[in-house]
């Protein structure tokens, strides 16, 4: 039975040219993290594998980095990088546990941070 | 449609060396944990090598170790096998594998195989 | 010898649930997944069954995985004449940080 809970950052806002943390945390399980992958819509930026170590997407080589953690940091931030973004923890024995963000990236300087929420 | 194309194998004397390789289309190679698998005439299969999104991590079964090196090139959507120091007991068809986007899912998608005979 | 175990061999005749076992240890199919393959005689094996108990799309709902333990079955009913072949598991091993492969089960259909 899948027990476990995803924190995430929530919604949040960034000014465009600035750099976000995407953060999700796993709670209420002792289940085993094998691996967590990082996705925009369908695409994949990154993956962080317990045995392996981090990968970051080709295509977002320039633009991501790993961590802090299990987390992931967006740089140089542009308007179509507005959007959902996924944490997809994939853990033994549970399954899959999925966690959302929305970014909305801002012209101005009216960037602020939203409320964290919770996705059981 | 997912491809591994193995080319390379052929006979060789104790002692010698041959590259294999691994030619791969229909899918974004570099997002992907790839391995190395062999058969030896009538036996079961042996996994031989595996390496990581960008090669910065391989591991190897005992049996290869310090002889036996993997890599990939991602630009060339391409991975090898180099062996060296080759022994009787390395006569198999040697089998190049994609791995699931969780690695430790196993592998999904194989080649047709190459053969490796040592013999003098 | 390999580090997960299998019957070398099982039979069954057309129609007929045949199950194949695979045994391991805490540090493989305990605290892992399991992969089953099917290779046909001259050919590459091909992927039946991934994360234990799942079913690639194209694979018919005939063949099924499970776990229990340190041991892991596969399950294939209905059995027909084109499902002669050898089967393996497989596991990923967290203390060798290798992939384990059972030694094989050659099936016959009667």
């Known amino acids: 039975m899948m027990t476990g809970t995803i924190e995430t950052t929530g919604n949040i806002s960034a000014e465009k040219g600035g750099s976000i943390i995407l953060q999700c945390h796993l709670s209420s399980t002792t289940a085993q993290v094998t691996q967590v992958n990082w996705e925009q819509q369908d695409q994949l930026l990154a993956i962080c594998n317990a045995d392996l170590g981090w990968h970051i997407s080709p295509s977002f080589k320039d633009r991501v980095a790993p961590g802090p953690g299990l987390g992931l940091t967006l740089q140089s931030l542009t308007v179509n990088d507005t959007g959902e973004y996924f944490c997809i923890y994939h853990t033994y024995p549970d399954g899959t546990y999925t966690g959302r963000i929305f970014l909305e990236v801002l012209e101005s300087s009216v960037a602020e941070h939203g409320a964290r929420f919770q996705i059981p | 449609e997912v491809q591994l194309l193995e080319s390379g194998g052929g006979l060789v004397q104790p002692g010698g060396s041959l590259r294999l390789s691994c030619a791969a289309s229909?899918?974004?190679?570099?997002?992907?944990?790839m391995s190395w698998v062999r058969q030896a005439p009538g036996k079961g299969l042996e996994w031989v090598s595996l390496i990581n999104w960008n090669g910065d991590k391989t591991y190897y079964a005992d049996s290869v170790k310090g002889r036996f090196t993997i890599s990939r090139d991602n630009s060339k959507n391409t991975l090898y096998l180099q062996m060296n120091s080759l022994r009787a007991e390395d006569t198999a068809i040697y089998y190049c594998?994609?791995?699931?986007?969780?690695?430790?899912?196993?592998?999904?998608?194989w080649g047709r195989g190459t053969t490796v005979t040592v013999s003098s | 010898q390999s580090v997960l175990t299998q019957p070398p061999s099982a039979s069954g005749t057309p129609g007929q649930r045949v199950t194949i076992s695979c045994s391991g240890s805490i540090s493989n199919i305990e605290t892992k997944y399991v992969s089953w393959y099917q290779q046909l005689p001259g050919t590459a094996p091909k992927l039946l069954i991934y994360?234990?108990?799942q079913r690639p799309s194209g694979v018919p709902d005939r063949f099924s995985g499970s776990k229990s333990g340190t041991s892991a079955s596969l399950a294939i009913s209905g059995l027909q004449s084109e499902d002669e072949a050898d089967y393996y598991c497989v596991s990923w091993d967290a203390s060798l940080k290798s992939w384990v492969f059972g030694g094989g089960t050659k099936l016959t259909v009667l």
């Open positions: 229909g899918f974004t190679f570099d997002d992907y944990v």
């Open positions: 994360n234990s108990d």
């Open positions: 594998a994609k791995h699931w986007i969780v690695f430790q899912y196993g592998m999904d998608v």
